[in-house]
C-alpha cells in the first residue's frame, strides 16, 4: 500500500494527495480504501469537530492560536487568532508568539535559562503532544533540579519544534506530535491555501529547509488546481 510513503518526509516527488492541502474542520474528507491521505483517513473519525475554522492550536499558523473570538462567547465557536506579544495576558503557551511562553498568565521571553528548563514533570524523554489545554494552566511544570533536557531525535514525541534536534521540526502525527525531518530540496511539501488551513491533516510534513521554499513544481503548471505538485525549491 501507499501508507508508508504518504506518511514519510523521506520520500521524494510523490504527488500530494488532495492537492497537498487538507479541508477545514467539519468539511467532508475521503480516502481510497487502504490508502492513508493527509486530508482523510479510514481510521479517523471527526465526530468531535464543529463546522468552525479551528479546534486545536496546531490547526492555526505559527503566529496564531485557536480560541473563541469573544470573551465569554460560545465555547464551540473557535477561530485562529493572532498570537499575543510579550507582556500580554495568556492562559497557555500557544497563545504567546514564537520566542515567548506563558508564565503566571503573562507572555514572557523564552530565553535559554528559563523555558528550556521547564521540562515535563517526569523528566521523560518525551513531551506533551497537543497545544490545547482546557484547564487554562500552562503546559509544563518547572523543575529547577534539571535545567537542560536533551533534544528529541526523529520519532520522539514533542510539543513544539524547539523540543526537537537540529534539522527536525515538531509535526502532527495522528493523535500525537513527533519530531520529523525538515524537508530537503526536491521533497514534496504541503502548501496550505491559507495559514491554518490544515485542520484535518492527520500527519504534517515539516517545512522546507533553509534557502528553500514550497512551490509548484515547474512541470506541473498544466495540472489541474487540485493536483499541483509542490516541492521544496531553491529561492
Amino acid at each position: 500500500t501507499l501508507n508508508s510513503v504518504l506518511n514519510s518526509n523521506a520520500i521524494k516527488n510523490l504527488p500530494p494527495p488532495l492537492g497537498g492541502a487538507a479541508g477545514h474542520p467539519g468539511s467532508a474528507v475521503s480516502a481510497a480504501p487502504g490508502i492513508l491521505y493527509p486530508g482523510g483517513n479510514k481510521y479517523q473519525t471527526i465526530d468531535n469537530y464543529q463546522p468552525y475554522p479551528c479546534a486545536e492550536d496546531e490547526e492555526c499558523g505559527t503566529d496564531e492560536y485557536c480560541a473563541s473570538p469573544t470573551r465569554g462567547g460560545d465555547a464551540g465557536v473557535q477561530i485562529c487568532l493572532a498570537c499575543r506579544k510579550r507582556r500580554k495576558r495568556c492562559m497557555r503557551h500557544a497563545m504567546c508568539c514564537p520566542g515567548n511562553y506563558c508564565k503566571n498568565g503573562i507572555c514572557v521571553s523564552s530565553d535559554q535559562n528559563n523555558f528550556r528548563g521547564e521540562i515535563e514533570e517526569t523528566i521523560t524523554e518525551s513531551f506533551g503532544n497537543d497545544h490545547s489545554t482546557l484547564d487554562g494552566y500552562s503546559r509544563r511544570t518547572t523543575l529547577s533540579s534539571k535545567m537542560y533536557h536533551s533534544k528529541g531525535q526523529e520519532g520522539s514525541v514533542c510539543l513544539r519544534s524547539s523540543d526537537c534536534a537540529t534539522g527536525l521540526c515538531c509535526a502532527r502525527h495522528f493523535w500525537s506530535k513527533i519530531c520529523k525531518p525538515v524537508l530537503k530540496e526536491g521533497q514534496v511539501c504541503t502548501k496550505h491555501r491559507r495559514k491554518g488551513s490544515h485542520g484535518l491533516e492527520i500527519f504534517q510534513r515539516c517545512y522546507c529547509g533553509e534557502g528553500l521554499s514550497c512551490r509548484i513544481q515547474k512541470d506541473h503548471h498544466q495540472a489541474s488546481n487540485s493536483s499541483r505538485l509542490h516541492t521544496c525549491q531553491r529561492h
Epitope: V5, S8, A10, N48, L134, R139, W175, I178
Partner: antibody
Framework: QVQLVESGGGLVQPGGSLRLSCAAS????????MTWVRQAPGKGLEWVSG????????YYADSVKGRFTISRDNSKNTLYLQMNSLRAEDTAVYYC????????WGQGTLVTVSS | DIVLTQSPATLSLSPGERATLSCRAS???????LAWYQQKPGQAPRLLIY???NRATGVPARFSGSGSGTDFTLTISSLEPEDFAVYYC?????????FGQGTKVEIK
C-alpha cells in the same frame, strides 16, 4: 510519578456494552494523546484506538470501528472507551497508555465476553 | 497494514549472555518510527526504546535499539535475571499501529 489506572472491565454477554475508564495522574493530562491497546489471553498486543490531547482527533482499528468510542474528560483527567456490540473476540485485557508510542501503561482491566 | 515479524520466536540464553532480537517490517518504514517493549507475565508492557534507537527513561544502558528501513534490532548486551520476558516491537508510522508477535527470552 505518572500513573494510569483502568477500571470498568468485567463479564458481559455478546452484544452487550461496557465502558472502561482510565484515571491519569502525575502529568499534565491534556497535553498528551492517549491510546487503548488490548491483549487477548495468551496472545500479543493489538492497538484499539487513539485520541488527541483535546479530544478533537480520534482513531480506531478496523476491528472495533463503529462499535467502540474513545473519549476523554480533561477536567477529570480521565480517558474512556465505550464498547458496544461486544463479541467473543473482544475478550482481552485492555490497557490505556500515553502517547503514540506508549511510554506509560496502566495495569490493565480484563473484559470477558461470553454467554 | 504493516506486518512486523519478530525472530526468533523464542531465545534461550543464560544470564550474562548477549541477546539479539530482530523485527522485520513488511514494508519500508523510511523513518525510525519503531518502539520496543518488554512484558513480564501478569504485568503491563514497558517501553524500552522509541524512535528505533532512543532509550526510554529509566531503561538500563544494556538495552539498545538499531536499524532502519525494514530491519530493526533490539540488543541486550549482557542479560540480567530480570530481563527474561517477552519483547514486542511496534511501528507508529502508519495506521493501524501494529505490533510484532513477540520474542520470548527464556533462561537456558
Amino acid at each position: 510519578q505518572v500513573q494510569l489506572v483502568e477500571s470498568g472491565g468485567g463479564l458481559v454477554q455478546p452484544g452487550g456494552s461496557l465502558r472502561l475508564s482510565c484515571a491519569a495522574s502525575g502529568f499534565t493530562f491534556n497535553n498528551y494523546g492517549m491510546t487503548w491497546v488490548r491483549q487477548a489471553p495468551g496472545k500479543g498486543l493489538e492497538w484499539v484506538s487513539g485520541i488527541s490531547g483535546s479530544g478533537s482527533y480520534t482513531y480506531y482499528a478496523d476491528s472495533v470501528k463503529g462499535r467502540f468510542t474513545i473519549s476523554r474528560d480533561n477536567s477529570k483527567n480521565t480517558l474512556y472507551l465505550q464498547m458496544n456490540s461486544l463479541r467473543a473476540e473482544d475478550t482481552a485485557v485492555y490497557y490505556c497508555a500515553r502517547t503514540i508510542y506508549m511510554d506509560y501503561w496502566g495495569q490493565g482491566t480484563l473484559v470477558t465476553v461470553s454467554s | 497494514d504493516i506486518v512486523l515479524t519478530q525472530s526468533p520466536a523464542t531465545l534461550s540464553l543464560s544470564p550474562g549472555e548477549r541477546a539479539t532480537l530482530s523485527c522485520r517490517a513488511s514494508q519500508n518504514l523510511f523513518s525510525p518510527y519503531l518502539a520496543w517493549y518488554q512484558q513480564k507475565p501478569g504485568q503491563a508492557p514497558r517501553l524500552l526504546i522509541y524512535g528505533a534507537s532512543n532509550r526510554a527513561t529509566g531503561v538500563p544502558a544494556r538495552f539498545s535499539g538499531s536499524g532502519s528501513g525494514t530491519d530493526f534490532t533490539l540488543t541486550i548486551s549482557s542479560l540480567e535475571p530480570e530481563d527474561f520476558a517477552v519483547y514486542y516491537c511496534q511501528q507508529y508510522l502508519t495506521l493501524p499501529l501494529t505490533f510484532g508477535q513477540g520474542t520470548k527470552v527464556e533462561i537456558k
